[in-house]
Amino acid sequence: TLNSVLNSNAIKNLPPPLGGAAGHPGSAVSAAPGILYPGGNKYQTIDNYQPYPCAEDEECGTDEYCASPTRGGDAGVQICLACRKRRKRCMRHAMCCPGNYCKNGICVSSDQNHFRGEIEETITESFGNDHSTLDGYSRRTTLSSKMYHTKGQEGSVCLRSSDCASGLCCDRHFWSKICKPVLKEGQVCTKHRRKGSHGLEIFQRCYCGEGLSCRIQKDHHQASNSSRLHTCQRH
């Protein structure tokens, strides 16, 4: 029933007032977009935990994977499901619990010398849950099942640009950091300020792509340098 669903899915809504930005009194500031998904709530028990909706494994916790809750179920309705333990059937690495991977359709223990290099340095997150260490930073520890995945796609939460797939960089979006496309030739870019010259940029742009640099656009109609657009231009 709706009651049981909603009682286990307690979400809190929000309103009023906000002062201006730090260093920008009175300015209207865009807040983080995003819906209020359920965290724990005081009416919740493990038994009636509301499943977390997902589109891909990266949106689920380290001990979960993304799939339809019923066999042959509607592929459009996917939730985070508990990972499969050793010797359980699987179709991909993400289905297996941390420390295991999918081999010949069965979850088997990971060889700790297996899979080195960038896999261990990667933490990606798609607007959801995570595969990081306790302190939120990448460490060479036991292999999480999620670490077999590709790097963060556009919109994935990230820590650094190396977390993002090719052609993307890790940059600020609202109050968080997500993978955004690297800028192409002719696109407007931001001349990043030196550290110390603080200016709040809620929406930062990525850097210019390979072979491009962010320069003032040559435009004779612009009155002053300060008002000129910067664009990505060939070196």
């Epitope: 007032p17 730090a22 807040a31 977009p33 995570d130 939120g136 600020r172 609202f174 109050w175 968080s176």
Partner: antibody, heavy 114, light 112 residues
Framework: QVQLVESGGGVVQPGRSLRLSCAAS????????MHWVRQAPGKGLEWVAV????????YYADSVKGRFTISRDNSKNTLYLQMNSLRTEDTAEYYC???????WGQGTLVTVSS | DIVMTQTPLSLSVTPRQPASISCKSS???????????LYWYLQKPGQPPQFLIY???NRFSGVPDRFSGSGSGTDFTLKISRVEAEDVGVYYC?????????FGQGTKVEIK
């Protein structure tokens, strides 16, 4: 499991201070902006404050500006709300929230009463 | 601040009949990322608000399909195709494209 757990609420006299904590787990805390939101008894929710992923920027609601301070310790995956000069109108359930795919904690009740 | 205006403020519905709630925002809620940050919540007495719809038309997992959201820009609608007794409460729309996040005044839905 992805979750946020608030603590530190309680009964306090007007003018006193209280520090709320929010322990995050199951996600990359240091990539997310974090918010505090409150709901006074019988009222709607009120956005209180936000802090950027790295703690470098903070914004506050006018109603708490100069009295409340939002901070975070990414090494401990913890968000804080230091509440000074508390007033009776600060009585509310306080929730920490993660932005983008915003997750909410279960709330911690703060009662300011003489 | 973005002002959210809901109509009607109260609604008395016969069980299994449809219900519709309107929400208008004073500014467009369409973000440059292509998403529209408009949400619908239900709050029942003594309970925290409960999320129903995100980004205009997406139902949260487990929310019955009798709930649907539609609209764009500044005009939005929440429809309940067949109201059940358990649907009573106050429904709110909310925007999160700009701080402060703001709400409609709420629409109280009751059963006749």
């Amino acid at each position: 499991q992805v979750q946020l757990v608030e603590s530190g609420g309680g009964v306090v006299q007007p003018g006193r201070s209280l520090r709320l904590s929010c322990a995050a787990s199951g996600f990359t805390f240091s990539s997310y902006g974090m918010h505090w939101v409150r709901q006074a008894p019988g009222k709607g929710l009120e956005w209180v404050a936000v802090i950027s992923y790295d703690g470098g920027d903070q914004y506050y609601a006018d109603s708490v500006k100069g009295r409340f301070t939002i901070s975070r310790d990414n090494s401990k995956n913890t968000l804080y709300l230091q509440m000074n000069s508390l007033r009776t109108e600060d009585t509310a359930e306080y929730y920490c929230a993660r932005e983008l795919r915003v997750l909410w904690g279960q709330g911690t009740l703060v009662t300011v009463s003489s | 601040d973005i002002v959210m205006t809901q109509t009607p403020l109260s609604l008395s519905v016969t069980p299994r009949q449809p219900a519709s709630i309107s929400c208008k925002s004073s500014q467009s809620l369409l973000h440059s990322d292509g998403k529209t940050y408009l949400y619908w919540y239900l709050q029942k007495p003594g309970q925290p608000p409960q999320f129903l719809i995100y980004e205009v038309s997406n139902r949260f997992s487990g929310v019955p399909d009798r709930f649907s959201g539609s609209g764009s820009g500044t005009d939005f609608t929440l429809k309940i195709s067949r109201v059940e007794a358990e649907d009573v409460g106050v429904y709110y729309c909310m925007q999160s494209i700009q701080l402060p996040w703001t709400f409609g005044q709420g629409t109280k839905v009751e059963i006749k």
